[in-house]
Amino acid sequence: YDFTNCDFEKIKAAYLSTISKDLITYMSGTKSTEFNNTVSCSNRPHCLTEIQSLTFNPTAGCASLAKEMFAMKTKAALAIWCPGYSETQINATQAMKKRRKRKVTTNKCLEQVSQLQGLWRRFNRPLLKQQ
């Protein structure tokens, strides 16, 4: 699956109206300078691929963000505004039902959410040249 056929403006609106606020809430109590992230993505489909990777998959030090409010709203936005996206999620949803773990916010998860904030900001400014 690639994100080429998504309605990017509708996804951007969903981000600005709600997902961004949930990301800020998750990060509350951390300084904006605490994580020195140089994440980037080259265009809107690529940004969404990276957002998909970091929102719904484990990474080193952060087992899962998929149950967080921003993640559920991200999934909803992609399901609504990206044709065919929902069909890619069947196995992942079933696997998630099997793994109901206690939520623990680790420093590594905060770092990962900081990376997500950078990706979303880049998604919202697609015409900016890469640094």
């Epitope: 719904f56 998959n57 990376q115």
Partner: nanobody, 117 residues
Framework: DVQLVESGGGVVQPGGSLRLSCAAS????????LYWYRQAPGKQRELIAS???????NYVDSVKGRFTISRDNSKNTLYLQMNSLRPEDTALYYC???????????WGQGTLVTVSS
């Protein structure tokens, strides 16, 4: 599906370096999120480094600053550069490739790293 084969393990002295490789065949490698795991004797397998298709990396604290994960999508290969190795890095190292949409994960067979003087 992706098939994975690791190489580059061996015996090294404390403070030394090794570079592990993980060669992939099959489809899907390009957009998958890739991992290096390790399993030390008598311990559980742990995820130590991850990299997205666009090169965003994450590390556990025990290897951060010493290990570097990278990928070459044109060669379908994942790497782990390991510097300043310590005896506690002795383990079987596995690469893994996870479909970012449905979560299906393919594993390599592992390559053994022994850090000993």
């Amino acid at each position: 599906d992706v098939q994975l084969v690791e190489s580059g393990g061996g015996v090294v002295q404390p403070g030394g370096s090794l570079r592990l490789s993980c060669a992939a065949s099959g489809s899907g490698f390009g957009v998958n999120i890739l991992y290096w795991y390790r399993q030390a004797p008598g311990k559980q397998r742990e995820l130590i480094a991850s990299i997205t298709s666009g090169g965003i990396t994450n590390y556990v604290d025990s290897v951060k600053g010493r290990f570097t994960i990278s990928r070459d999508n044109s060669k379908n290969t994942l790497y782990l550069q390991m510097n300043s190795l310590r005896p506690e890095d002795t383990a079987l190292y596995y690469c893994a490739s996870r479909n970012i949409f449905d979560g299906t994960t393919e594993w390599g067979q592992g390559t053994l790293v022994t850090v000993s003087s």
